[in-house]
Interface confidence: low
């Protein structure tokens, strides 16, 4: 079997405050059984953005179906826009673990510029 | 292996339909858009639109809207494309190609090509 | 959509020798391009995605370059199987056009 890609085929995303981004990702293979989360940076800092798995993110909603067995689409859109959404997102993969699930592999990041919005 | 294999050649009239199969085998056919190619005789590659066999989710070339149509059968991992109202222009080899990543960054695996012929 | 021209239309090499193909795109496609190559009855083979990175199993000979509008594919030394003909294709807007091929040829 193929090993698993994770794949951000945007490298950067330009949007207008106040708009919604949608950031691009999907895997290559079912395998390894795991959930996948968005993270903005990267390193001991990052900031979580999206757990397929638990959490309650409001201003992200799914572009497909996460729950469909045979999903590998896993981009996502963020609403309303900010100056402070700015950055660069990861789309990474987790392989199923006890008791902690464990980080199997990330997207190369997809970079999220604001414009100011139109007057 | 991962391999693609097609049906075999077609002879149609003019204003009829084909259906072209492509059974893939040797990795997830969920996990790879594939694509539709066609080579008139002596001529260059034409990219004729792609199929998700994850969602169904299809995109055509404009050329071709109306005309084609991409579906596939996940329980047996194949694909398949049909073209209507045929003419003889669309005489030409037509392959199936699997994309290198789940998004396009090239065509990795091709089938062997289906020859259509529409004479009348 | 977007133009691919290749140039030259027929490239005639001695084997050894050194080819350089060019596939240039009608607007930018940054580096979303991929070179493929077909010989006479055969499918087409991917050779180069993302404008330089070699396909799985593809002789280092092979090589991309370039990036937005201008594009290269090089074969360092042409060996006898490498006579054939060669597209560039741009994946980076829909439709994903093809160029219009350039056919290596013995000289």
């Known amino acids: 079997e193929d090993e698993l890609q994770v794949i951000q085929p945007e490298k950067s995303v330009s949007v207008a405050a106040g708009e919604s981004a949608t950031l691009r990702c999907a895997m290559t293979s079912l395998i390894p059984v795991g959930p996948i989360m968005w993270f903005r940076g990267a390193g001991a800092g990052r900031e979580l953005i999206y757990n397929q798995k638990e959490g309650h993110f409001p201003r992200v909603t799914t572009v497909s179906e996460l729950t469909k067995r045979n999903n590998l689409d896993f981009s996502i859109s963020i609403s309303n826009i900010t100056p402070a959404d700015a950055g660069t997102y990861y789309c990474v993969k987790f392989r199923k673990g006890s008791p902690d699930d464990v980080e199997f592999k990330s997207g190369a990041g997809t970079e999220l510029s604001v414009r100011a919005k139109p007057s | 292996q991962v391999q693609l294999v097609q049906s075999g050649a077609e002879v149609k009239k003019p204003g009829a339909s084909v259906k072209v199969s492509c059974k893939a085998s040797g990795y997830t056919f969920t996990g790879y858009y594939m694509h539709w190619v066609r080579q008139a005789p002596g001529q260059g590659l034409e990219w004729m639109g792609w199929i998700n066999p994850n969602s169904g989710g299809t995109s055509y070339a404009q050329k071709f809207q109306g005309r084609v149509t991409m579906t596939r059968d996940t329980s047996i991992s194949t694909a398949y494309m049909e073209l209507s109202r045929l003419r003889s222009d669309d005489t030409a080899v037509y392959y199936c190609?699997?994309?290198?990543?789940?998004?396009?960054?090239?065509?990795?695996?091709w089938g062997q090509g289906t020859t259509v012929t529409v004479s009348s | 959509e977007i133009v691919m021209t290749q140039s030259p239309a027929t490239l005639s090499v001695s084997p050894g020798e050194r080819a350089t193909l060019s596939c240039r795109a009608s607007q930018s496609v940054s580096s979303n391009l991929a070179w493929y190559q077909q010989k006479p009855g055969q499918a087409p083979r991917l050779l180069i995605y993302s404008a330089s990175t070699r396909a799985t199993g593809i002789p280092a000979r092979f090589s991309g370059s370039g990036s937005g509008t201008e594009f290269t594919l090089t074969i360092s030394s042409l060996q006898s199987e490498d006579f054939a003909v060669y597209y560039c294709q741009q994946l980076d807007n829909l439709p994903y056009t093809f160029g219009g091929g350039t056919k290596v040829e013995i000289k």
């Open positions: 190609a699997r994309d290198t990543y789940a998004y396009s960054y090239g065509m990795d695996v």
